[in-house]
Amino acid sequence: FERTRSLQDPCSNCPAGTFCDNNRNQICSPCPPNSFSSAGGQRTCDICRQCKGVFRTRKECSSTSNAECDCTPGFHCLGAGCSMCEQDCKQGQELTKKGCKDCCFGTFNDQKRGICRPWTNCSLDGKSVLVNGTKERDVVCGPSPADLSPGASSVTPPAPAREPGHSPQ
């Protein structure tokens, strides 16, 4: 079938990085500058994406693959293929539709994106608060209150561990 198709359609022989040029008797021509074809048999090449303004180039366009963009410092990607850049906030803040705003008491954000998350309620798992939460950090839960009876050895608060971070885009 593939052989039959290639006999009927000479364009199917054109590899990625070329296009089937109808103006030149269906000869395979290289993609012009700033364009690409990622699959064979294409009749046109696609225009390369340009990473301008708040977007910056993560991967240059080649004859066989589109450019890939990410965001300049102070912004982060949203959408498939980083279709949008959204401004970062500081840790301890969340981005609302009216801009960055501090986390309310009882919530925190240790990222530069997303919204403020409620502090862990240590008592739900029968534990006590070892280190209080802040706008930037969750509480640290310690042993259950029963474990902290008089005479029990004191517990040294651990250094805050790295909280879950960003997904790679």
Epitope: G114, R117, C141, E163, P164
Partner: antibody, heavy 120, light 109 residues
Framework: QVQLVQSGAEVKKPGASVKVSCKAS????????MHWVRQAPGQGLEWMGW????????NYAQKFQGRVTMTRDTSISTAYMELSRLRSDDTAVYYC?????????????WGQGTLVTVSS | SYVLTQPPSVSVAPGETARITCGGD??????VHWYQKKPDQAPVLVVY???YRPSGIPERISGSNSGNTATLTLSRVEAGDEADYYC????????????FGGGTQLIIL
């Protein structure tokens, strides 16, 4: 690639407990919060809670507080959800789902689900 | 706690446009996520943070959110789009941070 693989179906009697596991692969387990969501037959999705696999910190929906416990074993990249004092209306498919690295976005990867049937 | 209201079902002919709504008080101030749920399959995130599509989700699926209503739009609907669709938000101010709508069954005529 990211995968969340859950334990198999369970049949339990009312009053018993069930513990469902969710094994993560393809990413750094401690880097992403894990959520649990259930769907009872003919019903919608219901959020149960989350666990921070890094610290073990949890947050449970009030409806489940006192009956649910979420834990993790970082050595085997596995999260657990235990539900106690089971009732017939706890019959549902239970899903684990990964948060994408920051709070406030959608849950980007889901386990295949574990059917828990509560019947006398 | 916060309540999200969805119509139980929406019917549409193949090739037409389906619009599924999700109502909530000042929902425009929140970030809304949409999931597609087919029988015996896990939910799939199709739109996040009001209007962004994860990789692999077709461009004919889009979202919007303002005022008291968020909307998921599926254009050029196909038979494979038949499923339940759920909206979801995070509400940090309540004792139930994860909130789902009741779900909408999309019926392809």
């Amino acid at each position: 690639q990211v995968q969340l693989v859950q334990s198999g179906a369970e049949v339990k009697k009312p009053g018993a407990s069930v513990k469902v596991s969710c094994k993560a692969s393809g990413y750094t387990f401690t880097g992403y919060y894990m959520h649990w969501v259930r769907q009872a037959p003919g019903q919608g999705l219901e959020w149960m809670g989350w666990i921070n696999p890094n610290s073990g910190g949890t947050n449970y929906a009030q409806k489940f507080q006192g009956r649910v416990t979420m834990t993790r074993d970082t050595s085997i990249s596995t999260a657990y959800m235990e539900l106690s004092r089971l009732r017939s209306d706890d019959t549902a498919v239970y899903y684990c789902a990964r948060e994408p690295g920051y709070y406030g976005s959608g849950l980007d990867y889901w386990g295949q689900g574990t059917l828990v049937t509560v019947s006398s | 706690s916060y309540v999200l209201t969805q119509p139980p079902s929406v019917s549409v002919a193949p090739g037409e446009t389906a619009r599924i709504t999700c109502g909530g008080d000042d929902i425009g101030d929140k970030r809304v996520h949409w999931y597609q749920k087919k029988p015996d399959q896990a939910p799939v995130l199709v739109v996040y943070e009001d209007r962004y599509r994860p990789s692999g989700i077709p461009e004919r699926i889009s979202g919007s959110n303002s005022g008291n209503t968020a909307t998921l739009t599926l254009s050029r609907v196909e038979a494979g789009d038949e499923a339940d669709y759920y909206c979801q938000v995070w509400d940090s101010s309540s004792d139930h941070p994860g909130v789902f709508g009741g779900g909408t069954q999309l019926i392809i005529l």
